[in-house]
């Protein structure tokens, strides 16, 4: 069943040992159950690929998004699906492949001339009690009149950090995502203590730059857990 996929976390197809011949089986591992796809056919393993269950886009690969595999199916059962290419239908930015974003329900290139106004950004409503669904997805809201500047510059609307110029990352700002500077030494950073807690941030910070990590500031070790200040520090 679909639910059993979410409960399974054994490695499904071990690769051959280092130096081993292709096709040589590894250690015994659990088999993944099939998954039902549109049309009702059971998903069979193709080239050893098994659907990867997920709860949010960040669990998937950079060219994937997390969604229910069936239209109108169980919204609680989601897997990583291949991103949608240009001109394909979409409901939110993460569905579109890198270099594209979702506009009016279609994936369009974000690599166009200097400036584009009036992009429409579909977002998942994180708050409120209305959990109505459309094709198994959470209800979305549209924000218009966002400005899209030259690709990758600070303040540009983005989908992933790879859309931003060097030294910038893609981080949430209100309910959109824009390119923000990667944090430098001494700057305050965010450490997520609870799983998924970053989903509640409306002013998300970038990660720390190369050679830095987000650690508790030395003079804040004695402070209470809730008031601990993290900063980017050298290793």
């Amino acid at each position: 069943t679909l639910n059993s996929v979410l409960n399974s976390n054994a490695i499904k197809n071990l690769p051959p040992p280092l130096g081993g011949a292709a096709g040589h089986p590894g250690s015994a591992v659990s088999a993944a159950p099939g998954i039902l796809y549109p049309g009702g056919n059971k998903y069979q393993t193709i080239d050893n690929y098994q659907p990867y269950p997920c709860a949010e886009d960040e669990e998937c690969g950079t060219d994937e998004y997390c969604a229910s595999p069936t239209r109108g199916g169980d919204a609680g059962v989601q897997i990583c699906l291949a991103c949608r290419k240009r001109r394909k239908r979409c409901m939110r930015h993460a569905m579109c492949c890198p270099g594209n974003y979702c506009k009016n329900g279609i994936c369009v290139s974000s690599d166009q001339n200097h400036f584009r106004g009036e992009i429409e950004e579909t977002i998942t409503e994180s708050f409120g009690n209305d959990h109505s669904t459309l094709d198994g997805y959470s209800r979305r809201t549209t924000l218009s009149s966002k400005m899209y500047h030259t690709k990758g510059q600070e303040g540009s609307v983005c989908l992933r950090s790879s859309d931003c110029a060097s030294g910038l990352c893609c981080a949430r700002h209100f309910w959109s995502k824009i390119c923000k500077p990667v944090l430098k030494e001494g700057q305050v950073c965010t450490k997520h203590r609870r799983k998924g807690s970053h989903g509640l941030e409306i002013f998300q910070r970038c990660y720390c730059g190369e050679g830095l990590s987000c650690r508790i500031q030395k003079d804040h070790h004695q402070a209470s857990n809730s008031s601990r200040l993290h900063t980017c520090q050298r290793h």
Partner: nanobody, 129 residues
Framework: EVQLVESGGGLVQSGGSLRLSCTAS????????MGWFRQAPGKEREFVAA????????HYVDSVKGRFTISRDNAKDTVQLQMSSLKPEDTAVYYC??????????????????????WGQGTQVTVSS
């Protein structure tokens, strides 16, 4: 310089426990999967366990499921492998490794050693009967 340094190995009796630790330095590994592999004398290196870059999703080879637990602490840039109910066949050099978030993720991604960019020098675990 990027470094992964393992510690916590040693000699333990069958049925005993050990806790391996891997400390990362030189870059942030928040967007990397962290894994443990092992290599016994005269054998190929094999996958043991991995933990994803998001939501701490864990993966294990069947032979260690229920006995080993992998965890990570991004605040300290460390990954741990808690090993209990150890058996003589668990004797090996244990390596910590880091794999970047791929374009497409699959269960087999985590167990494929060639996906791991950074490797530690290893720590010896010996389980006596």
């Amino acid at each position: 310089e990027v470094q992964l340094v393992e510690s916590g190995g040693g000699l333990v009796q069958s049925g005993g426990s050990l806790r391996l630790s891997c400390t990362a330095s030189g870059r942030t590994f928040d967007n990397y999967a962290m894994g443990w592999f092992r290599q016994a004398p005269g054998k190929e290196r094999e996958f043991v366990a991995a933990i994803s870059w998001a939501l701490s999703r864990t993966h294990y080879v069947d032979s260690v499921k229920g006995r080993f637990t992998i965890s990570r602490d991004n605040a300290k840039d460390t990954v741990q492998l808690q090993m209990s109910s150890l058996k003589p066949e668990d004797t090996a050099v244990y390596y910590c490794a880091a794999a970047p978030r791929p374009k497409r993720v699959s269960f087999s991604y985590f167990s494929t050693s060639s996906n791991y960019e950074y490797w530690g020098q290893g720590t010896q675990v010996t389980v006596s009967s």
